[in-house]
Protein backbone atom coordinates (compact mmCIF):
# COMPACT_ATOMS: atom_id res chain seq x y z
CA UNK A 1 0.00 0.00 0.00
CA UNK A 2 1.32 3.47 -0.82
CA UNK A 3 2.60 5.45 2.14
CA UNK A 4 1.54 9.03 2.74
CA UNK A 5 5.03 10.18 1.66
CA UNK A 6 4.83 8.23 -1.60
CA UNK A 7 1.35 9.63 -2.21
CA UNK A 8 2.68 13.13 -1.56
CA UNK A 9 5.53 12.55 -4.00
CA UNK A 10 3.13 11.25 -6.64
CA UNK A 11 0.86 14.25 -6.15
CA UNK A 12 3.80 16.65 -6.47
CA UNK A 13 4.99 14.95 -9.67
CA UNK A 14 1.46 15.05 -11.11
CA UNK A 15 1.22 18.75 -10.23
CA UNK A 16 4.52 19.35 -12.04
CA UNK A 17 3.29 17.45 -15.09
CA UNK A 18 -0.01 19.32 -15.01
CA UNK A 19 1.70 22.71 -14.81
CA UNK A 20 4.11 21.84 -17.62
CA UNK A 21 1.21 20.82 -19.87
CA UNK A 22 -0.74 23.95 -18.91
CA UNK A 23 2.31 26.05 -19.70
CA UNK A 24 2.56 24.52 -23.18
CA UNK A 25 -1.13 25.04 -23.85
CA UNK A 26 -0.97 28.63 -22.60
CA UNK A 27 2.03 29.28 -24.85
CA UNK A 28 0.17 27.93 -27.85
CA UNK A 29 -3.02 29.84 -27.04
CA UNK A 30 -0.96 33.05 -26.72
CA UNK A 31 0.68 32.40 -30.04
CA UNK A 32 -0.36 34.87 -32.72
CA UNK A 33 1.51 33.55 -35.70
CA UNK A 34 0.84 31.78 -39.01
CA UNK A 35 2.87 28.88 -37.56
CA UNK A 36 -0.02 28.19 -35.18
CA UNK A 37 -2.22 27.16 -38.10
CA UNK A 38 0.50 24.76 -39.20
CA UNK A 39 0.91 23.42 -35.67
CA UNK A 40 -2.77 22.54 -35.61
CA UNK A 41 -2.40 20.38 -38.73
CA UNK A 42 -0.19 17.91 -36.85
CA UNK A 43 -2.10 14.95 -35.51
CA UNK A 44 -1.57 13.26 -32.16
CA UNK A 45 -2.66 9.85 -31.00
CA UNK A 46 -5.07 9.87 -28.08
CA UNK A 47 -5.33 7.10 -25.48
CA UNK A 48 -8.37 4.88 -25.72
CA UNK A 49 -8.41 4.91 -21.93
CA UNK A 50 -6.54 7.11 -19.49
CA UNK A 51 -7.53 6.60 -15.88
CA UNK A 52 -4.41 5.18 -14.21
CA UNK A 53 -0.76 6.15 -13.97
CA UNK A 54 0.26 3.25 -16.22
CA UNK A 55 -1.68 4.93 -19.03
CA UNK A 56 1.00 7.64 -19.07
CA UNK A 57 2.77 5.23 -21.43
CA UNK A 58 0.51 6.74 -24.10
CA UNK A 59 1.76 10.22 -23.30
CA UNK A 60 5.37 9.08 -23.26
CA UNK A 61 5.04 7.66 -26.76
CA UNK A 62 3.80 11.01 -28.09
CA UNK A 63 6.47 13.20 -26.47
CA UNK A 64 8.80 13.11 -29.47
CA UNK A 65 6.08 14.29 -31.89
CA UNK A 66 5.13 16.94 -29.33
CA UNK A 67 8.70 18.22 -29.21
CA UNK A 68 8.82 18.37 -33.01
CA UNK A 69 5.65 20.44 -33.18
CA UNK A 70 6.81 22.77 -30.41
CA UNK A 71 10.05 23.34 -32.31
CA UNK A 72 7.91 25.07 -34.93
CA UNK A 73 6.86 27.64 -32.38
CA UNK A 74 10.31 28.93 -31.53
CA UNK A 75 10.30 32.73 -31.35
CA UNK A 76 11.00 35.50 -28.87
CA UNK A 77 7.37 35.25 -27.71
CA UNK A 78 7.39 31.50 -27.12
CA UNK A 79 9.18 30.99 -23.83
CA UNK A 80 9.22 27.20 -23.64
CA UNK A 81 12.42 25.50 -24.74
CA UNK A 82 11.08 22.28 -26.30
CA UNK A 83 14.09 20.06 -25.59
CA UNK A 84 14.27 21.07 -21.91
CA UNK A 85 10.52 20.93 -21.53
CA UNK A 86 10.03 17.51 -23.10
CA UNK A 87 13.04 16.12 -21.24
CA UNK A 88 11.54 17.36 -17.97
CA UNK A 89 8.13 15.89 -18.80
CA UNK A 90 9.73 12.59 -19.81
CA UNK A 91 11.50 12.29 -16.45
CA UNK A 92 8.24 12.94 -14.59
CA UNK A 93 6.28 10.47 -16.74
CA UNK A 94 8.87 7.73 -16.22
CA UNK A 95 8.81 8.25 -12.46
CA UNK A 96 5.03 8.26 -12.33
CA UNK A 97 4.35 5.23 -14.49
CA UNK A 98 7.43 3.30 -13.40
CA UNK A 99 10.21 2.52 -15.86
CA UNK A 100 9.65 -1.22 -15.55
CA UNK A 101 6.03 -0.96 -16.75
CA UNK A 102 5.29 -3.20 -19.72
CA UNK A 103 1.88 -1.66 -20.42
CA UNK A 104 0.99 -1.59 -24.11
CA UNK A 105 -0.81 1.62 -24.98
CA UNK A 106 -4.10 1.38 -26.84
CA UNK A 107 -4.98 4.38 -28.95
CA UNK A 108 -8.34 5.73 -29.98
CA UNK A 109 -9.25 5.59 -33.67
CA UNK A 110 -9.52 9.36 -33.99
CA UNK A 111 -6.40 11.51 -33.91
CA UNK A 112 -6.35 14.96 -32.28
CA UNK A 113 -4.80 18.40 -32.64
CA UNK A 114 -2.09 19.52 -30.24
CA UNK A 115 -4.69 21.54 -28.30
CA UNK A 116 -7.03 18.55 -27.92
CA UNK A 117 -4.10 16.32 -27.01
CA UNK A 118 -2.86 18.68 -24.29
CA UNK A 119 -6.36 19.19 -22.91
CA UNK A 120 -6.82 15.43 -22.66
CA UNK A 121 -3.66 14.92 -20.62
CA UNK A 122 -4.34 18.00 -18.50
CA UNK A 123 -7.73 16.50 -17.62
CA UNK A 124 -6.02 13.19 -16.83
CA UNK A 125 -3.63 14.88 -14.37
CA UNK A 126 -6.40 16.91 -12.78
CA UNK A 127 -8.56 13.83 -12.34
CA UNK A 128 -5.86 11.82 -10.59
CA UNK A 129 -4.74 14.75 -8.43
CA UNK A 130 -8.35 15.18 -7.32
CA UNK A 131 -8.46 11.59 -6.10
CA UNK A 132 -5.24 12.14 -4.13
CA UNK A 133 -6.22 15.47 -2.55
Amino acid sequence: APTSSSTKKTQLQLEHLLLDLQMILNGINNYKNPKLTRMLTFKFYMPKKATELKHLQCLEEELKPLEEVLNLAQSKNFHLRPRDLISNINVIVLELKGSETTFMCEYADETATIVEFLNRWITFCQSIISTLT
Epitope: L12, H16, L19, D20, Q22, M23, L25, N26, N29, H79, L80, R81, D84, L85, S87, N88, I122, Q126, S130, T133
Partner: antibody, heavy 113, light 107 residues
Framework: QVQLVQSGAEVKKPGASVKVSCKAS????????MHWVRQAPGQGLEWMGI????????SYALKFQGRVTMTRDTSTSTVYMELSSLRSEDTAVYYC??????WGQGTLVTVSS | DIQMTQSPSSLSASVGDRVTITCRAS??????LAWYQQKPGKAPKLLIY???SLDSGVPSRFSGSGSGTDFTLTISSLQPEDFATYYC?????????FGQGTKVEIK
Protein backbone atom coordinates in the same frame (compact mmCIF):
# COMPACT_ATOMS: atom_id res chain seq x y z
CA GLN B 1 10.18 28.01 8.25
CA VAL B 2 8.98 28.24 4.66
CA GLN B 3 9.17 31.79 3.41
CA LEU B 4 9.57 34.01 0.37
CA VAL B 5 11.38 37.31 0.83
CA GLN B 6 11.04 39.93 -1.89
CA SER B 7 13.22 42.92 -2.75
CA GLY B 8 12.31 46.41 -1.63
CA ALA B 9 10.04 49.08 -3.11
CA GLU B 10 11.02 50.71 -6.39
CA VAL B 11 10.20 54.03 -8.05
CA LYS B 12 10.62 54.06 -11.82
CA LYS B 13 10.03 56.45 -14.68
CA PRO B 14 7.74 55.55 -17.60
CA GLY B 15 9.59 53.51 -20.22
CA ALA B 16 12.08 52.10 -17.71
CA SER B 17 12.37 48.49 -16.49
CA VAL B 18 12.14 47.02 -13.01
CA LYS B 19 13.51 43.73 -11.70
CA VAL B 20 11.96 42.27 -8.55
CA SER B 21 13.57 39.36 -6.70
CA CYS B 22 11.99 36.65 -4.58
CA LYS B 23 14.24 34.50 -2.39
CA ALA B 24 12.88 31.18 -1.19
CA SER B 25 13.90 29.35 1.97
CA UNK B 26 12.69 26.52 4.17
CA UNK B 27 11.77 24.14 1.36
CA UNK B 28 13.25 22.46 -1.72
CA UNK B 29 13.31 25.31 -4.23
CA UNK B 30 12.69 23.10 -7.28
CA UNK B 31 9.65 21.37 -5.77
CA UNK B 32 7.20 24.22 -6.36
CA UNK B 33 6.69 26.32 -9.45
CA MET B 34 6.67 30.06 -8.80
CA HIS B 35 3.83 32.33 -9.87
CA TRP B 36 3.85 36.12 -10.00
CA VAL B 37 0.70 38.06 -9.21
CA ARG B 38 0.23 41.81 -9.09
CA GLN B 39 -2.28 44.11 -7.44
CA ALA B 40 -2.82 47.71 -8.50
CA PRO B 41 -3.84 50.14 -5.72
CA GLY B 42 -7.39 49.38 -4.60
CA GLN B 43 -7.75 46.69 -7.27
CA GLY B 44 -7.93 42.92 -7.43
CA LEU B 45 -5.32 40.24 -8.06
CA GLU B 46 -3.89 39.64 -11.52
CA TRP B 47 -1.82 36.62 -12.57
CA MET B 48 1.28 37.49 -14.57
CA GLY B 49 2.92 34.15 -15.21
CA ILE B 50 4.80 31.14 -13.91
CA UNK B 51 8.32 29.75 -13.93
CA UNK B 52 9.48 26.17 -13.54
CA UNK B 53 12.34 26.60 -11.04
CA UNK B 54 14.10 23.39 -12.02
CA UNK B 55 14.31 23.91 -15.79
CA UNK B 56 13.76 27.66 -15.91
CA UNK B 57 11.11 27.76 -18.60
CA UNK B 58 8.21 30.13 -18.29
CA SER B 59 4.67 30.89 -19.37
CA TYR B 60 3.13 34.34 -19.23
CA ALA B 61 -0.32 35.88 -19.30
CA LEU B 62 -0.99 37.26 -22.77
CA LYS B 63 -1.33 40.79 -21.37
CA PHE B 64 2.34 40.78 -20.28
CA GLN B 65 3.77 38.81 -23.20
CA GLY B 66 6.78 40.63 -24.62
CA ARG B 67 7.22 42.87 -21.56
CA VAL B 68 7.81 40.39 -18.75
CA THR B 69 10.74 38.06 -18.19
CA MET B 70 10.91 35.57 -15.34
CA THR B 71 14.21 33.92 -14.47
CA ARG B 72 15.66 31.95 -11.59
CA ASP B 73 18.99 31.27 -9.90
CA THR B 74 18.95 27.81 -8.33
CA SER B 75 22.23 28.45 -6.50
CA THR B 76 20.54 31.14 -4.40
CA SER B 77 16.95 29.80 -4.59
CA THR B 78 15.86 33.10 -6.06
CA VAL B 79 13.33 33.93 -8.75
CA TYR B 80 13.28 37.22 -10.62
CA MET B 81 10.53 39.07 -12.45
CA GLU B 82 11.53 41.85 -14.83
CA LEU B 83 8.91 44.12 -16.37
CA SER B 84 9.97 46.49 -19.13
CA SER B 85 8.47 49.53 -20.91
CA LEU B 86 6.83 50.56 -17.67
CA ARG B 87 3.76 52.79 -17.71
CA SER B 88 1.77 54.43 -14.94
CA GLU B 89 -0.78 51.60 -14.91
CA ASP B 90 2.00 49.18 -13.89
CA THR B 91 2.05 50.87 -10.47
CA ALA B 92 1.18 47.95 -8.22
CA VAL B 93 2.32 45.58 -5.52
CA TYR B 94 4.01 42.56 -7.10
CA TYR B 95 3.86 39.22 -5.29
CA CYS B 96 5.64 35.94 -5.83
CA UNK B 97 3.85 32.83 -4.62
CA UNK B 98 5.03 29.26 -4.41
CA UNK B 99 2.32 26.62 -4.60
CA UNK B 100 -0.28 29.32 -3.73
CA UNK B 101 0.01 28.70 0.02
CA UNK B 102 3.23 30.66 0.51
CA TRP B 103 3.47 34.28 -0.60
CA GLY B 104 6.16 36.92 -0.54
CA GLN B 105 5.48 40.10 1.37
CA GLY B 106 5.02 42.03 -1.86
CA THR B 107 7.08 44.69 -3.63
CA LEU B 108 5.55 48.07 -4.39
CA VAL B 109 6.56 49.38 -7.80
CA THR B 110 5.61 52.98 -8.47
CA VAL B 111 5.81 54.30 -12.02
CA SER B 112 5.79 58.07 -12.14
CA SER B 113 7.39 60.80 -14.18
CA ASP C 1 -9.90 33.01 -20.43
CA ILE C 2 -12.14 31.83 -17.62
CA GLN C 3 -13.98 34.69 -15.94
CA MET C 4 -14.60 34.50 -12.20
CA THR C 5 -17.50 36.55 -10.84
CA GLN C 6 -17.94 37.08 -7.11
CA SER C 7 -21.00 38.32 -5.31
CA PRO C 8 -21.60 40.44 -3.45
CA SER C 9 -18.75 42.89 -4.09
CA SER C 10 -19.09 44.05 -0.50
CA LEU C 11 -21.17 43.25 2.56
CA SER C 12 -21.65 44.52 6.08
CA ALA C 13 -21.98 42.03 8.90
CA SER C 14 -21.68 41.77 12.65
CA VAL C 15 -19.49 39.56 14.80
CA GLY C 16 -21.20 36.18 15.13
CA ASP C 17 -23.02 36.43 11.81
CA ARG C 18 -22.99 33.67 9.24
CA VAL C 19 -21.51 35.04 6.02
CA THR C 20 -21.75 33.52 2.55
CA ILE C 21 -19.80 34.63 -0.52
CA THR C 22 -20.42 33.12 -3.93
CA CYS C 23 -18.18 32.73 -6.94
CA ARG C 24 -19.24 31.75 -10.44
CA ALA C 25 -16.92 30.56 -13.21
CA SER C 26 -17.70 31.28 -16.86
CA UNK C 27 -17.13 27.59 -17.63
CA UNK C 28 -16.79 24.41 -15.62
CA UNK C 29 -13.62 24.24 -13.53
CA UNK C 30 -14.47 21.03 -11.67
CA UNK C 31 -13.16 21.71 -8.14
CA UNK C 32 -10.06 23.68 -9.17
CA LEU C 33 -11.01 26.63 -7.04
CA ALA C 34 -9.31 28.34 -4.11
CA TRP C 35 -10.36 31.07 -1.69
CA TYR C 36 -8.04 33.73 -0.25
CA GLN C 37 -8.32 36.28 2.52
CA GLN C 38 -6.47 39.57 2.20
CA LYS C 39 -6.06 42.33 4.74
CA PRO C 40 -4.84 45.85 3.84
CA GLY C 41 -1.12 46.00 3.18
CA LYS C 42 -0.73 42.22 3.44
CA ALA C 43 -0.30 39.37 0.96
CA PRO C 44 -3.29 37.13 0.27
CA LYS C 45 -3.64 34.12 2.56
CA LEU C 46 -4.87 30.78 1.25
CA LEU C 47 -7.99 29.59 3.10
CA ILE C 48 -9.52 26.87 0.93
CA TYR C 49 -8.14 24.83 -1.95
CA UNK C 50 -9.78 22.22 -4.19
CA UNK C 51 -13.12 24.01 -3.54
CA UNK C 52 -13.62 22.54 -0.08
CA SER C 53 -10.28 21.59 1.52
CA LEU C 54 -9.24 23.76 4.45
CA ASP C 55 -5.60 24.86 4.35
CA SER C 56 -3.57 24.00 7.43
CA GLY C 57 -3.98 26.43 10.31
CA VAL C 58 -7.20 27.93 8.96
CA PRO C 59 -10.03 28.01 11.53
CA SER C 60 -12.85 25.53 10.99
CA ARG C 61 -15.44 28.32 10.84
CA PHE C 62 -14.33 28.72 7.21
CA SER C 63 -15.73 26.24 4.73
CA GLY C 64 -15.99 25.95 0.98
CA SER C 65 -18.35 24.06 -1.29
CA GLY C 66 -19.31 23.68 -4.92
CA SER C 67 -18.06 22.21 -8.17
CA GLY C 68 -18.43 22.95 -11.84
CA THR C 69 -19.29 26.63 -12.09
CA ASP C 70 -20.82 27.59 -8.74
CA PHE C 71 -18.89 27.88 -5.49
CA THR C 72 -19.46 29.19 -2.01
CA LEU C 73 -17.27 30.36 0.85
CA THR C 74 -19.01 30.33 4.23
CA ILE C 75 -17.87 31.83 7.52
CA SER C 76 -20.09 30.17 10.10
CA SER C 77 -19.58 32.75 12.85
CA LEU C 78 -17.79 35.92 11.86
CA GLN C 79 -14.93 36.95 14.15
CA PRO C 80 -13.32 40.42 14.45
CA GLU C 81 -10.21 39.21 12.61
CA ASP C 82 -12.30 38.04 9.63
CA PHE C 83 -13.05 41.55 8.38
CA ALA C 84 -11.07 41.57 5.14
CA THR C 85 -11.38 41.12 1.38
CA TYR C 86 -11.94 37.62 0.01
CA TYR C 87 -10.99 36.40 -3.45
CA CYS C 88 -11.81 33.23 -5.36
CA UNK C 89 -9.34 31.87 -7.91
CA UNK C 90 -9.42 29.20 -10.59
CA UNK C 91 -6.35 27.18 -11.50
CA UNK C 92 -8.18 24.82 -13.85
CA UNK C 93 -6.55 26.44 -16.86
CA UNK C 94 -4.04 29.15 -17.68
CA UNK C 95 -4.23 32.04 -17.40
CA UNK C 96 -5.06 31.68 -13.71
CA UNK C 97 -7.87 34.12 -12.93
CA PHE C 98 -9.31 35.67 -9.77
CA GLY C 99 -12.69 37.00 -8.80
CA GLN C 100 -12.91 40.77 -8.29
CA GLY C 101 -13.07 40.36 -4.52
CA THR C 102 -15.66 40.68 -1.77
CA LYS C 103 -15.01 43.17 1.01
CA VAL C 104 -16.46 42.11 4.37
CA GLU C 105 -16.98 45.18 6.54
CA ILE C 106 -18.21 45.76 10.08
CA LYS C 107 -21.88 46.69 10.32
Amino acid sequence: QVQLVQSGAEVKKPGASVKVSCKASGYTFTDYYMHWVRQAPGQGLEWMGIINPRAGYTSYALKFQGRVTMTRDTSTSTVYMELSSLRSEDTAVYYCTSGWDVWGQGTLVTVSS
Amino acid sequence: DIQMTQSPSSLSASVGDRVTITCRASQSISTWLAWYQQKPGKAPKLLIYAASSLDSGVPSRFSGSGSGTDFTLTISSLQPEDFATYYCQQSYSFPVTFGQGTKVEIK
